[in-house]
C-alpha cells in the first residue's frame, strides 16, 4: 500500500504553481465514476500538493485517485506525466 499515493504526490509536486491551480480547477468538473462525490471547491483552494494528495486518496482511495489524477493530467495536455503516474501505480 502507498505506492499509488506516492505516485500521485510525485506527479502533483512536478506541476508548476500555475499548473497546480489549473489541476484543481479541472478537478472540480472532471467526469467521475458513478457513486463518487466531488471534493468541495472551498477545500481545494489553499491546498498544496501534499494536502491535495491526501484529499484525493481519502475521497477516492488510492487506485481510483491515481486514475482520476492521471485523467486530469491528460485533460491538461500532460499525457507523459499521466502515463508515468499510471506506470508507477501498476508496478
Amino acid at each position: 500500500m502507498g505506492r499509488a499515493r506516492d505516485a500521485i504526490l510525485d506527479a502533483l509536486e512536478n506541476l508548476t504553481a500555475e499548473e497546480l491551480k489549473k489541476f484543481k480547477l479541472k478537478l472540480l468538473s472532471v467526469p467521475l465514476r458513478e457513486g463518487y462525490g466531488r471534493i468541495p471547491r472551498g477545500a481545494l483552494a489553499a491546498m498544496d500538493a501534499l494536502d491535495l494528495t491526501d484529499k484525493l486518496v481519502s475521497f477516492y482511495l488510492e487506485t481510483y485517485g491515481a486514475e482520476l489524477t492521471a485523467n486530469v493530467l491528460r485533460d491538461m495536455g500532460l499525457q507523459e506525466m499521466a502515463g508515468q503516474l499510471q506506470a508507477a501505480t501498476h508496478q
Epitope: 485523467n71 491528460r74 485533460d75 491538461m76 499525457q79 507523459e80 502515463g83
Partner: antibody, heavy 114, light 107 residues
Framework: QVQLQQPGTELVKPGASVKLSCRAS?????????????LEWIGNINLSNGRTNYN??FRAMATLTVDKSSSTAYTQLSSLTSEDSAVYYC?????????????WGQGTSVTVSS | NIVMTQYPKSMSLSIGERVTLRCKAS??????VSWYQQKPEQSPKLLIY???NRYTGVPDRFTGSGSATDFILTITSVQAEDLADYHC?????????FGAGTKLELK
C-alpha cells in the same frame, strides 16, 4: 467562435526551411495532411509556459516555438523534401476535458518544389 | 504509438440512411477519443470528444459511443451536408494519433 489565423500558401525549395505561424492560445497543435491522406500529429506547444511535445517522427525536422507577446505559435520545418508537401494545420485544445482539438486554422499549404 | 484503425475506408449511401463508422485503438485509450468531420478543401471540425460528448453546435443526429478500444460514430439520418471524411483520433497518450479516415459518399 475563435479564429486561428494561418497564412495560406508557402512555396519552398528542396532542402530549405519554412516557418509557419498561427495566432492562437492555450495548447496549440500542429497537424500535417498530405493530399488525399489522413491526419498526422507533429507536436504541440503550450503558449502560456512553452512546454512542448513532439511526435518522434517529426522531431528532427520540426521545431515548435511561441511568441507570448503576440500569442503566436510557430513551427519551423527544415530540410524539406517533396514528401513534406502538405497542408499544415494548427489547432487548439480549449475544451476543459479529454483534450480534443476543437478549433482549427484554415491550414497553410506548403509546396516543396525546385 | 497507439494505432487507430478506422473502417470501412469508404461508404456509399443514400440520404436518410443510418450510418455506423467504427474506430479501433491498438490499446486501451479510456474515453480519450474524438471524431472530426472534414469536407473537401476545408479544415477538420470537431464533432464528438470524450467518446460520447457532442461538441457545441453539432446536430443531435451525430452520436458517439464506446470506450477502451472500440468506438463508434453513428449518424442516424444522413443529410447531404454530412458527405465528408470522418477521422477519429486519440488524446490518451503522446504522440496523438488519428485513424486513416472514412469517406462518406452518395450512392
Amino acid at each position: 467562435q475563435v479564429q486561428l489565423q494561418q497564412p495560406g500558401t508557402e512555396l519552398v525549395k528542396p532542402g530549405a526551411s519554412v516557418k509557419l505561424s498561427c495566432r492562437a492560445s492555450g495548447w496549440t497543435h500542429w497537424v500535417k495532411q498530405r493530399p488525399g491522406q489522413g491526419l498526422e500529429w507533429i507536436g504541440n506547444i503550450n503558449l502560456s509556459n512553452g512546454r512542448t511535445n513532439y511526435n518522434e517522427k517529426f522531431r528532427a525536422m520540426a521545431t515548435l516555438t511561441v511568441d507570448k507577446s503576440s500569442s503566436t505559435a510557430y513551427t519551423q520545418l527544415s530540410s524539406l523534401t517533396s514528401e513534406d508537401s502538405a497542408v499544415y494545420y494548427c489547432a487548439n485544445s480549449m475544451v476543459p476535458h479529454f483534450f480534443p482539438m476543437d478549433y482549427w486554422g484554415q491550414g497553410t499549404s506548403v509546396t516543396v518544389s525546385s | 504509438n497507439i494505432v487507430m484503425t478506422q473502417y470501412p475506408k469508404s461508404m456509399s449511401l443514400s440520404i436518410g440512411e443510418r450510418v455506423t463508422l467504427r474506430c479501433k485503438a491498438s490499446e486501451n485509450v479510456g474515453s480519450y477519443v474524438s471524431w472530426y468531420q472534414q469536407k473537401p478543401e476545408q479544415s477538420p471540425k470537431l464533432l464528438i470528444y470524450g467518446a460520447s460528448n457532442r461538441y457545441t453546435g453539432v446536430p443531435d443526429r451525430f452520436t458517439g459511443s464506446g470506450s477502451a478500444t472500440d468506438f463508434i460514430l453513428t449518424i442516424t439520418s444522413v443529410q447531404a451536408e454530412d458527405l465528408a471524411d470522418y477521422h477519429c483520433g486519440q488524446s490518451y497518450n503522446y504522440p496523438l494519433t488519428f485513424g486513416a479516415g472514412t469517406k462518406l459518399e452518395l450512392k
